[in-house]
């Protein structure tokens, strides 16, 4: 039981569990496609351990393999409101450095109201994800409906 | 390599791995919208590692933040079912105690047969989950379509 | 501080740490409908720590509870392309040894272009998982819209 | 309590239409679809449609081409028309509440039925 | 379409036994977890009354000595003890898929 306690005495980010998940801010003006993200306990029940949020987009702070998730609902939609202002599309990527610029995770809404999806990628301390919603629909901003979030998973 | 025997011989709870995976067993009665879902190795491939089953609803045991996530397939469903039957959606919450009582994920089907999210939450010892399904139609139960899972992430 | 140094030094294996994110190669002649994927830095931001390809399926080496997740995307793709097609369907499941052959995973198109989705699941070594798409549509190979992974989450 | 009350023409002229309303109390078609199924000696029970809470109709392809199922939520009447009828359509019509359960297709709740004559 | 076969077409029977009432589907009527075939009765000059949903779920009201099994393609209605007012006609339907179809019916008869 030693080793236990001594895992629990050790500050949790010498073990690499780097950890955030965010909740919409707002949408950039209308040449910017990018969500702009906040988190933080007194928002709710959004978080930051590790990474930090830089303008609104999350920045890494620990190399490694990471599980990237997002949610995305489009504000009072329906089925028929998505298939008149089609294409509307989700794209997660690493925008900065330029030199790293990658999309990581794109999906369209079609005749659908949410996206969600996940995937494994490798990031680098200093990478920063940026979120891109292109098209010209408002997301919602309920913190159930919308929401970004990464988790550090191995070196 | 002394760590990781030491690693192995710990009980897997103390190291705080709670994981739970559950299948849908029945739904409520009509003015119930919560699923009830089962897990163990008997029923196949749902498990319970940590958390419980309370009538049919998933209770956490350890504190911390935990990856929760989700699939529900409408039963005998095709693009027009979904279309037909207004609105359905999946919301999946605390429910108990009622003092932290919150809506964490919230997807609606429109012309779809399936939802599927995940999301990272703090969850707290003794948080019950619900999975309420608000609509009329009946969710397949096979267990590759609907399932209901959570993953212990980090303190 | 002396912990943290002496997991590093460990080879990540021995901590369990399985991982892999692949993209899609090619799907199978005509009769065959699984994906066949591939992994590796040269490839991009796909890699198999643990994890190994044969012939194109995902063979899994370390016993435990994994995280399985996956997005296909349909290739030049609109909600009536879904449609006209139907049924679209992807499933993932153990498809040798033939004693543990089940579906773990499975959904369908229907008006949408992609499908993602992740689940928990029980799988032991010598497991390979196959992907089955059925329908007579292409799936898209770009790499942010057509993935597959599994990360080891417990023993 | 739940109940369906149908009103219509006992005797209808052969290539001539068949209208039935089917007025229902207790329920609303906003939140439950409603089925309409026909018995006769020689075929016994036949599913010919139903009418769901979006306004959305499913028909037994066998009679699409002369069915029209249409409904009036304020009003809670729901409206058959049969074109083309023949004496083989002599049958007793029945209008029933579909189950709570959208995809489960049973019908918990049936009208009293409209016998129908197809006869010159 | 699926097409469900009821046997016998006749039963008679008398108080206090078993009635056994079967109902074969020309395919599968299984999908989504659940096997979709209900039971009706049917009493002369009335419409047809639910009796079990989902081949063995009894419908409010429905008195216990009802009862539904079967899988896949055979389905059995089982009424024991039959009491005087079971006689009636027994229809099987099922919801897999549209057209829903109903079997010819099994007229119960008290001897």
């Known amino acids: 039981q030693r080793f236990a306690q001594a895992q629990q005495q050790l500050p949790l980010e010498s073990l690499g569990w780097d950890v955030a998940e965010l909740q919409l801010n707002h949408t950039g003006p209308q040449q910017d496609p990018r969500l702009y993200w906040q988190g933080g306990p007194a928002l709710g029940r959004s978080f930051l351990h590790g990474p930090e949020l830089d303008k609104g987009q999350l920045r890494i702070h620990r190399d490694g393999i990471y599980m990237v998730h997002i949610q995305v609902t489009l504000a009072i939609c329906s089925s028929t409101t998505a298939s008149r202002h089609h294409p509307t599309t989700l794209a997660v990527g690493i925008c900065s450095p330029a030199s790293r610029s990658i999309s990581l995770l794109r999906l369209s809404f079609h005749q659908g109201c949410t996206i969600a999806s996940q995937r494994l990628t490798p990031l680098a301390r200093g990478d920063t994800l940026c979120t891109n919603l292109t098209g010209t629909l408002l997301p919602s901003r309920n913190t159930d409906e919308t929401f970004f979030g990464v988790q550090w998973v191995r070196p | 390599q002394r760590f990781a025997q030491a690693q192995q011989q710990l009980p897997l709870e103390s190291l705080g791995w709670d994981v739970a995976e559950l299948q849908l067993n029945h739904t409520g009665p009509q003015q119930d919208p919560r699923l009830y879902w089962q897990g163990g190795p008997a029923l196949g491939r749902s498990f319970l590692h940590g958390p419980e089953l309370d009538k049919g609803q998933l209770r956490i045991h350890r504190d911390g933040i935990y990856m929760v996530h989700i699939q529900v397939t409408l039963a005998i469903c095709s693009s027009t079912t979904a279309s037909r039957h207004h609105p359905t959606t999946l919301a999946v919450g605390i429910c108990s105690p009622a003092s932290r009582s919150i809506s964490l994920l919230r997807l609606s089907f429109h012309q779809g047969c399936t939802i599927a999210s995940q999301r990272l939450t703090p969850l707290a010892r003794g948080d019950t989950l619900c999975t309420n399904l608000t609509g009329t139609l009946l969710p397949s139960r096979n267990t590759d379509e609907t399932f209901f899972g959570v993953q212990w992430v980090r303190p | 501080q002396r912990f943290a140094q002496a997991q590093q030094q460990l080879p990540l294996e021995s901590l369990g740490w399985d991982v892999a994110e692949l993209q899609l190669n090619h799907t199978g002649p005509q009769q065959d409908p699984r994906l066949y994927w591939q992994g590796g830095p040269a490839l991009g931001r796909s890699f198999l720590h643990g994890p190994e390809l044969d012939k194109g399926q995902l063979r899994i080496h370390r016993d435990g509870i994994y995280m399985v997740h996956i997005q296909v995307t349909l290739a030049i793709c609109s909600s009536t392309t879904a449609s006209r097609h139907h049924p679209t369907t992807l499933a993932v499941g153990i498809c040798s040894p033939a004693s543990r052959s089940i579906s773990l995973l499975r959904l369908s198109f229907h008006q949408g272009c992609t499908i993602a989705s992740q689940r928990l699941t029980p799988l032991a070594r010598g497991d390979t998982l196959c992907t089955n798409l059925t329908g007579t549509l292409l799936p898209s190979r770009n790499t942010d819209e057509t993935f597959f992974g599994v990360q080891w989450v417990r023993p | 309590q739940v109940q369906l009350k149908q009103s219509g023409p006992g005797l209808v002229q052969p290539s001539q239409k068949l209208s039935i309303t089917c007025t229902v109390s207790g329920f609303s078609l906003t939140t439950y679809g409603v089925h309409w199924i026909r018995q006769s000696p020689v075929k016994g029970l036949e599913w010919l449609g139903v009418i769901w809470t979006t306004g959305v109709v499913d028909y037994n392809a066998a009679f699409i081409s002369r069915l029209n199922i249409t409904k009036d939520n304020s009003k809670s009447q729901i409206f058959f028309k049969m074109n083309s009828l023949q004496t083989n359509d002599t049958a007793m019509y029945y209008c029933?509440?579909?189950?709570?359960?959208?995809?489960?297709?049973?019908?918990?709740?049936w009208g009293q039925g409209t016998s129908v004559t197809v006869s010159s | 379409d699926i097409v469900l076969t009821q046997s016998p077409a006749s039963l008679p029977i008398f108080l206090g036994q078993r009635a056994t009432i079967s109902c074969r589907a020309s395919?599968?009527?299984?999908?989504?977890?659940?096997?979709?075939m209900h039971w009706y009765q049917q009493k002369p000059g009335q419409p047809p009354k639910l009796l079990i949903y989902l081949v063995s779920n009894l419908e409010s009201g429905v008195p216990a000595r009802f009862s539904g099994s079967g899988s896949g393609t055979d389905f059995t209605l089982n009424i024991h003890p039959v009491e005087e007012e079971d006689a009636a006609t027994y229809y099987c339907?099922?919801?897999?898929?549209?057209?829903?179809?109903f079997g010819a019916g099994t007229k119960l008869e008290l001897k």
């Open positions: 395919r599968s009527v299984s999908a989504s977890g659940y096997t979709f």
């Open positions: 029933a509440r579909n189950s709570y359960y959208g995809n489960l297709y049973v019908m918990d709740y």
């Open positions: 339907q099922h919801s897999r898929e549209f057209p829903l179809t």
